[in-house]
């Protein structure tokens, strides 16, 4: 990535890190309004299996691992990128390394969910307070989950699917911050680990993933009112370890692995027409990226 100043633009889709032959340090941003990609400041340490989120206009890269020819190191790191200066700075690390982590943001606090450290699959969850630069453990999930999809809806944190070390999962659970407790919710129709999970129009979407046999292109959404999962249109590509985000009322999925190829494909879902379309390609194929969208 270049180290010059990033142009001051509106809402961008950021993709950080990922994996292709080894963990990557790329930070790139896609501007859906004109279809261009920006090459931004590299992560200080390459990582895949990380998660991305935005708090207060700053992009955070959370967890993952550095899988390189020199070795394989799971990451407890939290790093903060300032789009105005195009610079990364380290923040307080998590209590444990978390590869294939999920993250969500509630009231400006980052929740780091599950992930793995070596052969340990975490059910632990911790919360970061940016103003104090501190992490604190909260109640653990009811299930160990790596490759977990995390989303926030109505100030509740949902952990969806993943892998407990023995089985890929279709189960999902919900965290209530006021009670500091987790409760199971209706299981998905499909086992999904490494799915893309996000919130759009009061529904939680789970896209793609891996069911223990194959990569998936199916997509389902959870209606919190009816507590049911319903299939919507499938993606054009099967993919696991994909990136996902929502931009202006549409879902974007980025990259992933289809069982043969590291995808550069970016697809966009329009809920009004229940259709997926290919909108762009990343500059190279990769899986295990961290993705987030800047605020206005």
């Amino acid at each position: 990535g270049s180290m010059g100043h990033a142009p001051k633009v509106g809402r961008l889709i950021y993709t950080a890190g990922g994996y292709f032959r080894q963990s990557l340090s790329y930070l790139e941003a896609y501007n859906p309004s004109d279809g261009t990609w920006l090459d931004l400041a590299d992560l200080q340490v390459p990582r895949s299996g990380l998660a991305g989120c935005v708090v207060g206009g700053l992009l955070y890269a959370v967890g993952g691992r550095n899988n390189s020819p020199d070795g394989n190191t799971d990451s407890s790191a939290l790093d903060c990128y300032n789009p105005m200066t195009n610079q990364w700075s380290p923040c307080a690390p998590m209590s444990v390394p978390r590869n294939r982590i999920g993250v969500g943001v509630i009231d400006g606090h980052i929740y780091a969910v599950g992930g793995s450290h070596g052969c340990i699959h975490h059910n632990s969850v911790e919360r970061y307070e940016p103003e104090r630069d501190e992490w604190h453990l909260v109640a653990p999930m009811l299930t160990r989950r790596i490759g977990v999809g995390v989303a926030v809806l109505n100030r509740l944190l949902y952990a969806v699917g993943g892998f407990d070390g023995t089985n890929r999962l279709n189960s999902a659970e919900c965290y209530y911050p006021e009670r500091n407790e987790w409760r199971m919710i209706t299981a998905m129709n499909t086992i999904r680990s490494g799915a893309g999970v996000c919130v759009l129009h009061n529904c939680i979407y789970a896209a793609g993933g891996y069911d223990g046999q194959d990569q998936l292109n199916s997509v389902e959404r959870y209606d919190v009112e009816t507590e049911t999962w319903t299939f919507v249109a499938p993606m054009k590509h099967r993919r696991s370890a994909l990136g996902i985000t929502v931009h202006q009322g549409r879902i974007y999925v980025l990259g992933g692995y289809d069982g043969h190829t590291f995808l550069d494909s970016v697809e966009c879902y329009d809920p009004d027409t229940d259709t997926w379309s290919e909108v762009t390609r990343m500059t190279s194929g990769r899986s295990g990226v961290g993705v987030a969208v800047t605020m206005e």
Partner: antibody, heavy 120, light 107 residues
Framework: EVQLVESGGGLVQPGGSLRLSCAAS????????IHWVRQAPGKGLEWVAS????????LYAKSVAGRFTISADTSKNTAYLQMNSLRAEDTAVYYC?????????????WGQGTLVTVSS | DIQMTQSPSSLSASVGDRVTITCRAS??????VAWYQQKPGKAPKLLIY???SLYSGVPSRFSGSRSGTDFTLTISSLQPEDFATYYC?????????FGQGTKVEIK
Amino acid sequence: EVQLVESGGGLVQPGGSLRLSCAASGFAISASSIHWVRQAPGKGLEWVASIDPETGETLYAKSVAGRFTISADTSKNTAYLQMNSLRAEDTAVYYCAREYAWWYAAADYWGQGTLVTVSS
Amino acid sequence: DIQMTQSPSSLSASVGDRVTITCRASQSVSSAVAWYQQKPGKAPKLLIYSASSLYSGVPSRFSGSRSGTDFTLTISSLQPEDFATYYCQQSYSFPSTFGQGTKVEIK
């Protein structure tokens, strides 16, 4: 019946290349991590490389990193080990093995092995 | 890398004997240890996974146990087909590493 059959071994000069194949039957390689493990003549077992079917990520022993590449073709239900810049110390029987479960990372099915000899 | 120090490197025993093989990890590996049996010219066979779980189809005379970073494979009553080399393997930390092997020979 689960079976793994390696092929592609042989005699190669130092600095040369070989591509080993591991043909699986009785299970889908898309459902398990596949490992390569080697055993030098009269010596013990050494883990070499593995590939994760979910993320596509690969791992390598330091002794082979940058020279060996593991891959899988799910349409052929076959895994591969591309070995470049071979050295005398790479001489060994190479086994492919199926991971029993990620949590345990133990290999429950192994191929019969293929001998790679690196010598001038 | 985590070292798995296996002992003894060889032992002589008779049919019906109780045989114990030990592996000591250089640091904590939790219970992520497997044991294999290998006969000359053959591939290894999985006996024990997760330190103490008997793999399907393996005779119950084989057992595994853990005490901290020490792992033990026990054959309660040695049978003629058990004369082989045995290896431990840790998969807790990258890279996975094996013990150097224990050859069980006929006394």
